[in-house]
Interface confidence: low
C-alpha cells in the first residue's frame, strides 16, 4: 500500500524521499517517475539525478531540497487533477537489485473557494531526515542500465511479484529514507 499525500489544484505538491550518502558528495543516482516503480529504472521519468547533478527534468518537476545531502524529495508546481496518481522514487543503490523503491500516492483535490495552504504532513516528525554520513571511502556507483523505453504493461506482473512487502513498515519506521553504505 502506498503512502498518500494530498495537495490542492493550483498549489505545489511535495513527495518526500531521502537517502543518506555513504560519504559527503558520494551521490547515488535517483529517478522519479509517474506510475508505480517497475522492475528496473522508472517509468515515465519526470526527473533524474546522477552522481553529480540533476541531469534530467521536465516542466514543473524539481528538487527543492539539498539533493547533495540526500534530500531527493519531489516538488510538483501548480498541480492539476491530472497529476493525481502513483509516483515512484527509485534510489539506485550500487549492486544489482539493491535499488530502493518507494511508491507514493498523490491525491489532488479541487481548489476550495477560499484558497488554503497545501495539506501536508509534519514531515519533520513523520520522516526524520537521517542525513548523518558513514565512514566509507569513495564508492563507484553501480546502477542498473538505463531503460527509458521500458514497457510498464509488459512487466507489471513481474513488478508486482518483486514489490517489497516491507515497504509499508519501512515507510512507517523511517519515512522514504534509507542509508547508503
Amino acid at each position: 500500500s502506498e503512502v498518500e499525500y494530498r495537495a490542492e489544484v493550483g498549489q505545489n505538491a511535495y513527495l518526500p524521499c531521502f537517502y543518506t550518502p555513504a560519504a559527503p558528495g558520494n551521490l547515488v543516482p535517483v529517478c522519479w517517475g509517474k506510475g508505480a516503480c517497475p522492475v528496473f529504472e522508472c517509468g515515465n521519468v519526470v526527473l533524474r539525478t546522477d552522481e553529480r547533478d540533476v541531469n534530467y527534468w521536465t516542466s514543473r518537476y524539481w528538487l527543492n531540497g539539498d539533493f547533495r545531502k540526500g534530500d531527493v524529495s519531489l516538488t510538483i508546481e501548480n498541480v492539476t487533477l491530472a497529476d493525481s496518481g502513483i509516483y515512484c522514487c527509485r534510489i539506485q543503490i550500487p549492486g544489482i537489485m539493491n535499488d530502493e523503491k518507494f511508491n507514493l500516492k498523490l491525491v489532488i483535490k479541487p481548489a476550495k473557494v477560499t484558497p488554503a495552504p497545501t495539506r501536508q504532513r509534519d514531515f519533520t516528525a513523520a520522516f526524520p531526515r537521517m542525513l548523518t554520513t558513514r565512514g566509507h571511502g569513495p564508492a563507484e556507483t553501480q546502477t542498473l542500465g538505463s531503460l527509458p523505453d521500458i514497457n510498464l504493461t509488459q512487466i507489471s506482473t513481474l513488478a508486482n511479484e518483486l514489490r517489497d512487502s516491507r515497504l509499508a513498515n519501512d515507510l512507517r519506521d523511517s519515512g522514504a529514507t534509507i542509508r547508503i553504505g
Epitope: 555513504a22 549492486g95 539493491n98 542500465g145
Partner: antibody, heavy 117, light 113 residues
C-alpha cells in the same frame, strides 16, 4: 575482515534434500547482496540463486521450483534449501556477497554437494 | 538475460608470452550516466573461490599484478596477461553486472605450452 563460511554439503541420493548454510560477518550480511554459485566438475561457474538485503530473490532456470534461497538476518546466515536433487546438481557450492558500496565480491571457500545413488 | 560469450575456450601460452582472452556480451553493458562498463574478470583456480582481477572493464583490483589488464567497451572486452607466469594457470571468466542475473562467460582455460 569479511568472512563467509559454508556448511551443509555432503552426499545425497537423487530426489533427496540438503540445506546449505553460509555464515557471514555482520556488516556484509546486513547490507549485502548474497548469492550462491556452483561449479560442477569440469564445468564453469553458474549463478544458482541470489537474494538482496530486502529479500528479493533470483534463481537460475535449472533450479527454479527445487531450490529456495533465504536469509536469517538475526543469525547473519544465508541458506539454500535444495530439494529434488539430481545428479547434475553435483558441484562445489560457493556463497558470495557483494556490498552495496563495493564492486568486489567476497567468496566462501565452498562446500561439496554430491548427488549419487 | 545478457549472454556472455568467451573465446577461446582454452589456450596454451609459453611462459613469458602474452595471453589474450575475449569476451562478448549480447547487449551493451556500458551505462552512459557514469561512463562505466559493468564488466569484471575473475580468475578461478581448482579448490579456490574466484578472485576478482578487473572491474569496470579496465580497473585492476588492489593487489593484482600489473601484467593483468582489461580493455574494451560496450559489448567487446579483452583480458590480457602480458607475460604469463606459472601461477597464472587457471580458468578466467568475464561477468557482467549491468543487469540481473549477473551472467558469466563460459570460461577460458589458460595453460602453459
Amino acid at each position: 575482515e569479511v568472512q563467509l563460511v559454508e556448511s551443509g554439503g555432503g552426499l545425497v541420493q537423487p530426489g533427496g534434500s540438503l540445506r546449505l548454510s553460509c555464515a557471514a560477518s555482520g556488516s556484509i550480511f546486513s547490507n549485502g547482496y548474497m548469492t550462491w554459485y556452483r561449479q560442477a566438475p569440469g564445468k564453469g561457474l553458474e549463478l544458482v540463486s541470489s537474494i538482496n538485503s530486502r529479500g528479493v530473490t533470483n534463481y537460475a532456470d535449472s533450479v527454479k521450483g527445487r531450490f529456495t534461497i533465504s536469509r536469517d538476518n538475526s543469525k547473519n546466515t544465508l541458506y539454500l534449501q535444495m530439494n529434488s536433487l539430481r545428479a547434475e546438481d553435483t558441484a562445489v557450492y560457493y556463497c558470495a556477497a557483494l556490498l552495496p558500496h563495493e564492486i568486489r565480491k567476497y567468496w566462501g571457500q565452498g562446500t561439496q554437494v554430491t548427488v549419487s545413488s | 538475460d545478457i549472454q556472455m560469450t568467451q573465446s577461446p575456450d582454452s589456450l596454451a601460452v609459453s611462459l613469458g608470452e602474452r595471453a589474450t582472452i575475449n569476451c562478448k556480451s549480447s547487449q551493451s553493458v556500458f551505462y552512459n550516466s557514469n561512463n562505466k562498463n559493468y564488466l569484471g574478470w575473475y580468475q578461478k583456480k581448482p579448490g579456490q573461490p574466484p578472485k576478482l582481477l578487473i572491474f569496470w572493464a579496465s580497473t585492476r583490483e588492489s593487489g593484482v599484478p600489473d601484467r593483468f589488464s582489461g580493455s574494451g567497451s560496450g559489448t567487446d572486452f579483452t583480458l590480457t596477461i602480458s607475460s604469463l607466469q606459472a601461477e597464472d594457470v587457471a580458468v578466467y571468466y568475464c561477468q557482467q553486472y549491468y543487469s540481473t542475473p549477473r551472467t558469466l562467460g563460459g570460461g577460458t582455460k589458460v595453460d602453459i605450452k
